[in-house]
């Protein structure tokens, strides 16, 4: 019971576009060390949406502070929402490893529906 | 084994609060969720809202909306429900429910409930 | 909202013949991470609800495996195999798929 959980509660998210879209994620223990990372879908196909080690992601802001000691929140927003950003998103931690980092373990995925823009 | 220990019965007067509490005997709340689901008297059962601890927010019925507060205290592994505005109608059985998180499918279900709080509206 | 519609509203039984409870969604509870998020609850006279199935068809601890559910998308079945009397009270099925949760209405089983 003490083993990380990496928490997504919600299942849906539905957001009008042009709007920000929100999805929660939560880790309930510090251990393993290593970076977590967004991706839309699942498998190989995967598309990486943001990454806490590395790289330049202008739509995506983080909800609290990362680098804060003992954040445990790894919330994003997704600024000016499109019908392309529809799909499933996973929030995954990974193991701190050497070469690479190892996938530990995914959140369950939520669902982002982008609604016709209000008139 | 843990159990979720809930509050006594309650009688109150319309117009008046009642809050009812709900702790994890022998346990923490780590990841789970806590939900209230309440049944009046011969009558099915009414999801009214939940909160994670971990995140510290609710999520409320639209019903219950503006009416209802739900909270929880880490440290003694107790979650409160506060129903406001209180009305005739609102003479049900109150329980809490554990919700257990798991890793691929998230919350979706109960495993475990209180025994139940009885809140009596009258005047 | 999602709508949990369930039938029979009462179903009498006998000890030892088989039992059936139909549960339908007004939307889909199927998630593109594969799970239903269906769950059936048994609420004995007098006692708290108890969790029977979650997940469209996973059995919980402890339950009888008399006890089974079927289905997917917005059709969902309880069955129980081998009625005793011990299983006598009010099932519900309950959707965790939208906010807010719902539940059916209810089915009262009682002996013949």
């Known amino acids: 019971e003490d083993e990380l959980q990496v928490i997504q509660p919600e299942k849906s998210v539905s957001v009008a576009a042009g709007e920000s879209a929100t999805l929660r994620c939560a880790m309930t223990s510090l251990i393993p060390v290593g970076p977590i990372m967004w991706f839309r879908g699942a498998g190989a196909g995967r598309e990486l949406i943001y990454n806490q080690k590395e790289g330049h992601f202008p739509r995506v802001t983080t909800v609290s502070e990362l680098t804060k000691r003992n954040n445990l929140d790894f919330s994003i927003s997704i600024s000016n929402i499109t019908p392309a950003d529809a799909g499933t998103y996973y929030c995954v931690k990974f193991r701190k490893g050497s070469p690479d980092d190892v996938e530990f373990k995914s959140g369950a995925g939520t669902e982002l529906s982008v609604r016709a823009k209000p008139s | 084994q843990v159990q979720l220990v809930q509050s006594g019965a309650e009688v109150k007067k319309p117009g008046s609060s009642v809050k009812v509490s709900c702790k994890a005997s022998?346990?923490?709340?780590?990841?789970?969720?806590i939900s209230w689901v309440r049944q009046a008297p011969g009558q099915g059962l009414e999801w009214m809202g939940s909160i994670i601890p971990i995140f510290g927010t609710a999520n409320y019925a639209q019903k219950f909306q503006g009416r209802v507060t739900i909270t929880a205290d880490e440290s003694t592994s107790t979650a409160y429900m506060e129903l406001s505005s209180l009305r005739s109608e609102d003479t049900a059985v109150y329980y809490c429910?554990?919700?257990?998180?798991?890793?691929?499918?998230?919350?979706?279900?109960?495993?475990?409930w209180g025994r139940g709080t009885l809140v009596t509206v009258s005047s | 909202d999602i709508v949990m519609t369930q039938s029979p509203l009462s179903l009498p039984v006998t000890p030892g013949e088989p039992a059936s409870i139909s549960c339908r969604s007004s939307?889909?509870?199927?998630?593109?991470?594969?799970?239903?998020?269906l769950d059936w609850y048994l609420q004995k006279p007098g006692q708290s609800p108890q969790l029977l199935i979650f997940?469209?068809?996973n059995r919980a601890s402890g339950v009888p495996d008399r006890f089974s559910g079927s289905g997917s998308g917005t059709d969902f079945t309880l069955k129980i195999s081998r009625v005793e009397a011990e299983d006598v009270g009010v099932y519900y099925c309950m959707q965790a798929r939208g906010s807010p949760i719902t539940f059916g209405g209810g089915t009262k089983v009682e002996i013949k």
């Open positions: 939307q889909s509870l199927l998630h593109s991470n594969g799970y239903n998020y």
């Open positions: 429910a554990r919700a257990p998180y798991g890793s691929s499918s998230g919350y979706g279900y109960f495993d475990l």
């Open positions: 022998g346990g923490t709340f780590s990841s789970y969720a």
């Open positions: 997940l469209g068809s």
